[in-house]
């Protein structure tokens, strides 16, 4: 008799799952020196631990713990790049930009990026079927819980200046309910952080509108200003032209703004 | 601007003891969790302790669990590492961090263990 299965709103765990995740680890190491002493399959084995033979509505932080340990890693805490509704281009800036970080340029952010996983209650399998969804379903999810607190310590391990990439396109250039909005915002730390400098990218060519006044934008000054931190905002009119203006400086085009 | 100084490394033998000291500043200590990490030579950077600002929480590694003790006095902005029956895998340089990871920026110099016969 087939046992019946929980079906969720969200799609299910990502194809060769374990395999990926230790694929991923075993890359990172490689492209990583400081990192090469990081035993890949005890990062599995505490990735697995987090979620399998749990109820995918009842993850908690603490599930994660054994992983955040050994995912142990020197960030450059006034090099931090947060983004929101915009990964593509944060990463491509980070790739050139190489002393900068993203979530993702970490080992853990690496291993997750793009992923889905959930388990099961009481039994060992991956559902690969579906995994629940964070509206539709319930919010303590394996993904949502991983993505809070990874987030969560990422801010608050920011200090000095923390830039911030914004979507100029989205209706909402800054969504309160986005991990940047209701995460990041509220842990990045007063005493150890001094600005937070938004770069909101333009869509179009023609666009000459001044983005950092928009009201999502001050609202997010207000947010953070009340939070005893100061808020810069700039204009990237022509992303194209900024990524080629971080590449190489010095061309006589980058002077003029981007 | 966050500031720390660590103290209190040295040379000492297999299943001998050392107390590590970390001074901090340019910061509301007790508002912050702390944590040490060390790095052996040639190796990675590996999260040892964490203790929570009001040292209500505390955590540590399952390689030095049952052999090292973390704690702070709040009122002289110091965090301390009891470090008994020492082993010659705990030689590194130690660094104590604000925050409980995984991602840390060490601001002190370190201060190096050495546990050799």
């Known amino acids: 008799v087939p046992r019946w299965r929980q079906q969720w709103s969200g799609p299910g765990t990502t194809k060769r799952f374990p395999e990926t995740v230790l694929a991923r680890c075993v890359k990172y190491t490689e492209i990583h020196p400081e990192m090469r002493h990081v035993d890949c399959q005890s990062v599995w084995d505490a990735f697995k631990g987090a979620f399998i033979s749990k109820h995918p509505c009842n993850i908690t932080e603490e599930d994660y713990q054994p992983l955040m340990k050994l995912g142990t890693q020197t960030v450059p805490c006034n090099k931090i790049l947060l983004w929101s509704r915009i990964k593509d281009l944060a990463h491509q800036f980070t790739q050139v930009q190489r002393d900068m970080f993203t979530l993702e340029d970490t080992l853990l952010g690496y291993l997750a990026d793009d992923l889905t996983w959930c388990g099961e209650f009481n039994t060992s399998k991956i559902n690969y079927q579906s995994c629940p969804d964070w509206r539709k379903d319930c919010s303590n999810n394996p993904v949502s819980v991983f993505w809070k607190t990874v987030s969560r310590r990422f801010a608050e391990a920011a200090c000095d200046v923390v830039h911030v990439m914004l979507n100029g396109s989205r209706s909402k250039i800054f969504d309160k309910n986005s991990t940047f909005g209701s995460v990041e915002v509220h842990n990045l730390q007063p005493e150890k952080v001094q600005t937070l400098e938004a770069w909101v990218i333009h869509g179009g060519r023609e666009d000459s509108r001044d983005l950092c006044q928009d009201p999502t934008i001050k609202e997010l000054e207000s947010i953070i200003s009340k939070r005893n931190i100061q808020f810069s905002c700039k204009n990237i009119y022509r992303p194209d032209k900024f990524l080629q203006c971080v590449k190489n400086p010095e061309d006589s085009s980058c002077t003029s703004e981007i | 601007e966050v500031q720390v100084l660590e103290s209190g490394g040295g040379l000492v033998q297999p299943g001998g003891s050392l107390r590590l000291s970390c001074a901090a500043s340019?910061?509301?200590?007790?508002?912050?969790?702390m944590s040490w990490v060390r790095q052996a030579p040639g190796k990675g950077l590996e999260w040892v302790s964490a203790i929570s600002g009001s040292a209500g929480s505390i955590d540590y590694a399952d390689s030095v669990k049952g052999r090292f003790t973390i704690s702070r006095d709040n009122s002289k902005n110091t965090l301390y590492l009891q470090m008994n029956s020492l082993r010659v895998e705990d030689t590194a340089v130690y660094y104590c961090a604000d925050g409980t990871g995984p991602f840390f920026d060490y601001r002190g110099q370190g201060t190096l263990v050495t546990v050799s016969s």
């Open positions: 340019g910061f509301t200590f007790s508002r912050f969790a």
